[in-house]
Every structure is written in structure tokens, then in C-alpha cells.
Amino acid sequence: MAVTACQGLGFVVSLIGIAGIIAATCMDQWSTQDLYNNPVTAVFNYQGLWRSCVRESSGFTECRGYFTLLGLPAMLQAVRALMIVGIVLGAIGLLVSIFALKCIRIGSMEDSAKANMTLTSGIMFIVSGLCAIAGVSVFANMLVTNFWMSTANMYTGMGGMVQTVQTRYTFGAALFVGWVAGGLTLIGGVMMCIACRGLAPEETNYKAVSYHASGHSVAYKPGGFKASTGFGSNTKNKKIYDGGARTEDEVQSYPSKHDYV
């Protein structure tokens, strides 16, 4: 029961995390104009991974896409790549984890198969979360560097006669969404990996002696395990976690149509 809960919770947390990563990637507020030096500006600038926007005090917002690929900074391209990789891995992880969920039955899929799928999706979520965190952190580092560079150059070039306030950018909402989403995906992935340990058959516990009788093969197991049919994967053992209560697929002791596939 605890394993199912851990797996289910891991899936939900990862789902929220990946939705957050997608949202952060699409958001325009990766960097927003720093108003500390010019709090009275009537024009507000903010930038995303795909376009930059200007909101005028009238409420009119104009956004322009980055229509160049080669002209963009390498760091921005790297951030884009990291976020996309994170989304792709996360999406695949979600797809795999749906089939791995203990509460969902697909044919006579064994717990060991579900355990492997849970581990796979867990690793994918961990990598996805790390990609998002890395992407957001790289962008944040880029902002910090540019912020201090623009601060140093803020009032240069006009001989002190005319103030030319250079626009500085600070952390936008997307960065925080990205960090949180990446963290959630990472946590979800770890939970999936923990759930996998509970799902996987532990060889050390399976001190089963197999007696082959004439007719059809039946493997007899010590207490806590039940005999499986001699059809299909007859050497796979299923552990009963709830003190003898049988799950739906464990009650089936005769071959079904799925066993022949």
C-alpha cells in the first residue's frame, strides 16, 4: 500500500513539476526590467527564451520574437536546449510511469516489469528536473553577470551632461517557476525510484524450491508467496505485501488469453 502511495505521489508531483517546466519555458518573464534605478519608468521591459516584450503604461504590450538563431547568445541557446531536453525527458517519463503505476493493470504485466518502468521513469524525472534547474540557473547566472556589467557602465558615454540610464534586468517570475518545477520533478523522480525498490522482487527473500511434477509444472513457494501457473513467466514470484490479501491479478491462477501473447 505504501509503495502504491509513494509511486502515485511521485507521479503526481512529477506531473506538476513537468507542467511547471513547460509553463516556465513558455513564459515571457525570464528577465524583467530592474526598476530600482528608474522606478518611475512608464515603459516596462521583460524577456523570455523566445521573445522580448515591452509593456507601455497604457497597457499596450508589444512582443517581438527572436527570429534569428545564429545571432542569439550561446548561453540562451544552451538554456533553451536544457529546458527542451527537460520537457522531452519528462514527457517520456510521464508516459512510461503511467504504464508503471501499480493501480493500473495492463494485461498480466509483472511487478518486476512495473518496477523497471518505475525506475526508468524515476531516472527520467530526475534528469528532467536537473535539466530544468540547470537551465534556469545558467540563465540566472547570465542575468547576474549582465546586471553588474550594466551597473558599471550605467552613466558612461555622455560626459556627465545627459543621463542615459541603461536598462538593467533582474530575475523574472519564470526563473522561480522553473526552480520550483525542476525541484518538484526531481522529488517526484526520487519518489518513483524509492517506489521501484518496493516493487522489485528481492532475490534474497525468494528461497523457493521448485518441484516439477508430471503433467503441468507448478512451483511451490514458502509462505508469503503463492504458486503461479506453469504458463508464461512461471518462475516469477509475487510477494503479498498486505498480509495475505490478494490483488486482482494474483487471484487468477489459471491461464488467461493474455498469457499466450
Epitope: 519608468t41 521591459n45 522580448s52 507601455e56 497604457s58 497597457g59 545627459v162
Partner: antibody, heavy 119, light 113 residues
């Protein structure tokens, strides 16, 4: 078509308050900022502040912040500008102007309200 | 506050003349985010409210004759009337639209010679 009709001329004594109204028609009143600008006799233009009818949010010129109050009545599509503690230098023509959505410049102006402050 | 300085304060010209008036701001009105200059030009005739001519330093408002053109960037701006018509004799104001409070220049009065 867009129209901004302002209230009539006012004569006030120093220290008193004046409330100028601006009735809008021909457009969605709640979608545009309403600006207030004044012009003293023979002088240039001076921006007082602005109000957004939908949210009621305001932005005042620091010079007038302590004395000005801008309000709106969305049911009648009317904007109000109240200036308190009047002085003789507040004698001017007060204009309301609608905020143009595609740029931040006002594109429709009221006919102006003459406020005279005299003892 | 941004100080807007217009010159000359008055200008005497004949119909058909080409006219140029300047506006200087104490701070740059160029927004790096979209490379637009937030400067507006108004025309005002006696007893009338101002009329918007040009915004974003060079974009003509709809209905404004093409003899009016705006140029400049950063802190220096120019309004040019290619061929002055009788209805153009008025006072012209530039306005900072970049920073609160929005400030106006002192105006340039265009008079008949």
C-alpha cells in the same frame, strides 16, 4: 465617435477645492487610461496624473500628489479630478485626455475647464 | 523629472517654407527593449486642446498630413514641416512619454512672417 465633455468654468477662493468632471462617450470607458493635464494662461502644458477606470489605479505627478484626487464613476463613464488647497497659481485650463492604446500618448482631449482661483 | 527643452521658442515663417524645430531631453527617451523613442509631438491652436501629431518620435498619428515628420533618437529630436500651410500656424509641444511624470517642453510658436 469618441467624445470627452468636461464640466463648466469654476471660480474658487484660495484654500478651497475644485472638482472637475469629464464624461466619456463613443468608446469603452474602462479600457483606457484617463489623463489630466493643465495649462496656465500663456504657459505650457503640465501633466497632473492619470487614472485607469477599470482598476481605479492612479499615477500622480509628485508635485500634485498631496492635493489631487482622481476618481471615476463607471456607471456614468465619468472621470473626476479634485484639486484641494487651491492657490492663485492653480488658475489654469484643466484638460482630460484619453490614453491611446497603441501608444502611450493621449489621442482624445476634452474641451477644457477653466478654473480661476481668486480672492 | 526629465526636463524637456524646445528651441526656438518662436519661429516666423512664410507659407510653403520648410520648418524645423528641436526638442532636447535631459535623459534618454530611447527604450532598449524595443528600440523606440518615447517622445510625442503635439500641435495646439489658441482656445483649443492639444492635438497629437507624432508619437514614438517618428510615427505619425492617423489623419496627420505627411508634411509633418519626426526624427531623432535618445535625447535630441526634431519636428519638420516640409511645406508650411496656413492651418499649421500654432504652438508645438514635445512631451516625454518615457518616465513619470510625463513632462512637456516649453513649446515652439510658429508665426506668419
Amino acid at each position: 465617435q469618441v467624445q470627452l465633455v468636461q464640466s463648466g468654468a469654476e471660480v474658487k477662493k484660495p484654500g478651497a477645492s475644485v472638482k472637475v468632471s469629464c464624461k466619456a462617450s463613443g468608446y469603452t470607458f474602462t479600457s483606457y487610461w484617463m489623463h489630466w493635464v493643465r495649462q496656465a494662461p500663456g504657459q505650457g502644458l503640465e501633466w497632473i496624473g492619470m487614472i485607469h477606470p477599470n482598476s481605479g489605479s492612479t499615477n500622480y505627478n509628485e508635485k500634485f500628489k498631496s492635493r489631487v484626487t482622481m476618481t471615476v464613476d463607471t456607471s456614468t463613464s465619468t472621470a473626476y479630478m479634485e484639486l484641494s488647497s487651491l492657490r492663485s497659481e492653480d488658475t489654469a485650463v484643466y484638460y482630460c485626455a484619453r490614453r491611446y492604446y497603441g501608444s502611450i500618448s493621449p489621442d482624445y482631449w476634452g474641451q477644457g475647464t477653466t478654473v480661476t482661483v481668486s480672492s | 523629472d526629465i526636463v524637456m527643452t524646445q528651441s526656438p521658442s518662436s519661429l516666423s515663417v512664410s507659407v510653403g517654407d520648410r520648418v524645423t524645430m528641436t526638442c532636447k531631453s535631459s535623459q534618454s527617451l530611447l527604450n532598449s527593449g524595443n528600440q523606440k523613442n518615447y517622445l510625442t509631438w503635439y500641435q495646439q491652436k489658441p482656445g483649443q486642446p492639444p492635438k497629437l501629431l507624432i508619437y514614438w518620435a517618428s510615427t505619425r498619428e492617423s489623419g496627420v498630413p505627411d508634411r509633418f515628420s519626426g526624427s531623432g533618437s535618445g535625447t535630441d529630436f526634431t519636428l519638420t514641416i516640409s511645406s508650411v500651410q496656413p492651418e499649421d500656424f500654432a504652438t508645438y509641444y514635445c512631451q516625454n512619454d518615457y518616465s513619470y511624470p510625463f513632462t512637456f517642453g516649453g513649446g515652439t510658436k510658429l508665426e506668419i512672417k
